[in-house]
């Protein structure tokens, strides 16, 4: 006897498969538990994470992770080499850069190893879950007496890859002014006031051109430029969380 | 994984109405405020409104009263209704999430104006074109 379960997901483009099986009808007197959902993330392209809430077990259970891609010379699932552990528990995978393949479908099934027939796969795109790392390097030029460049890089990561959000603002301003800046690392800003001092700061994400990530990288440093007079309200110029 | 996708957006005439739709997927709206983002043609951006969990939505003072934004927890949908709609309204509108954020007062003057950047996770956009 089998049952194929189509488990709601996160993604339009994940579908989890739930399989259950059992030798005979007489012996199904409790239904298989379901697994919890693997959530993986690529981190700058240089590893990625798949990782599952292991407190949703009844009982402490160390689930085994297998991967695969959907298209490739090896049809067969290989088990995770380098697992994530949550109070002794596997509770993660990492998988390393030379196992990643973003234009392919992966192929994740999470399986409790007491029980073989309990197992959830989930197919996964993963152009679509990078999470860039800050943008770095940020620096500030003149491009003549008023104007001002911010340029900044991108480590491992094509810079036509992602999409930049630049926040500002002078040591007047109550809030920041934000821009939507795509593909190019720069920004200029048109005129700026040699009195005031101002702030940069920019965060990425993996969008539109080469994925659709939609989670922004955590923000990078901030870089200053201008006066160095004392602020008249530094609590207006704290920086947001 | 987090999933928002938005849908609605188009070409309409000034003076019109739109109503944006965002199906939001792979968590609870209890642990998240949602709101709808624009970006204006000069690549501005601003937040238009926020539902949070006080049930005291913020509208940015330029949509006051046209707009209007509401939450089916049961179809895990986040609205935006357009009303009155200008040529400045012309932009990319995204869904976005954030952690929830604590309810500093009722009086609106005593919150941080609420920014893009505050909103870790957005989704595709959507095209709103006001012209007649």
């Known amino acids: 006897w089998s049952s194929k379960v189509l488990m709601s997901s996160a993604n339009e483009d994940i579908k989890a498969d739930l399989i259950l099986t059992s030798t005979a009808p007489e012996h199904l007197s409790a239904p298989t538990l379901p697994l919890p959902e693997v959530q993986c993330f690529v981190f700058n392209i240089e590893y990625m994470n798949c990782t599952w809430n292991s407190s949703s077990e009844p009982q402490a259970t160390n689930l085994t992770l297998h991967y695969r891609y959907k298209v490739s010379d090896n049809n067969t699932f290989q088990e995770c080499s380098h697992y994530l552990f949550s109070k002794e528990i596997t509770s993660g995978c990492q998988i390393q850069k030379e196992d990643i393949q973003l234009y392919q479908t992966f192929v994740v099934q999470l399986q409790d190893p007491q029980k073989p027939q309990r197992r959830a796969v989930q197919k996964l795109n993963l152009q679509n879950l990078v999470i860039p790392r800050a943008p770095e390097n940020l620096t500030l030029s003149n491009l003549s007496e008023s104007q001002l460049e911010l340029r900044w890089k991108s480590r491992h990561i094509k810079e036509r890859c992602l999409q930049y959000l630049v926040q500002y603002r002078s040591n007047r301003d109550r809030s920041w002014t934000e821009l939507i800046v795509n593909h190019e690392p720069r920004f200029s800003l048109p005129s700026v006031d040699e009195l005031k001092r101002y702030t940069f700061r920019v965060r990425s994400r993996y969008n539109p051109i080469c994925g659709s990530s939609q989670q922004w990288s955590k923000w990078s440093q901030p870089v200053h430029w201008g006066s160095h007079t004392v602020e008249e309200n530094p609590s207006l110029f704290a920086l947001e969380a | 994984q987090v999933q928002l996708q938005e849908s609605g957006g188009g070409l309409v005439q000034p003076g019109g109405s739109l109503r944006l739709s965002c199906t939001v997927s792979?968590?609870?709206?209890?642990?998240?405020?949602m709101g709808w983002l624009r970006q204006n043609p000069g690549n501005e951006c601003g937040v238009v409104s926020v539902i949070t969990s006080d049930d005291n939505p913020y509208y940015d003072d330029s949509v006051k009263g046209r707009f209007t934004i509401s939450e089916d927890n049961a179809k895990n949908m986040v609205y935006l209704q357009m009303n009155s709609l200008k040529p400045e309204d012309t932009g990319v509108y995204y869904c976005a999430t954030r952690s929830r954020q604590p309810v500093y007062s009722r009086d609106y003057e005593l919150r941080p104006r609420p920014l893009c950047g505050d909103f870790g996770v957005w989704g595709q956009g959507t095209q709103v074109t006001v012209s007649s």
């Open positions: 792979g968590f609870t709206f209890d642990e998240s405020d």
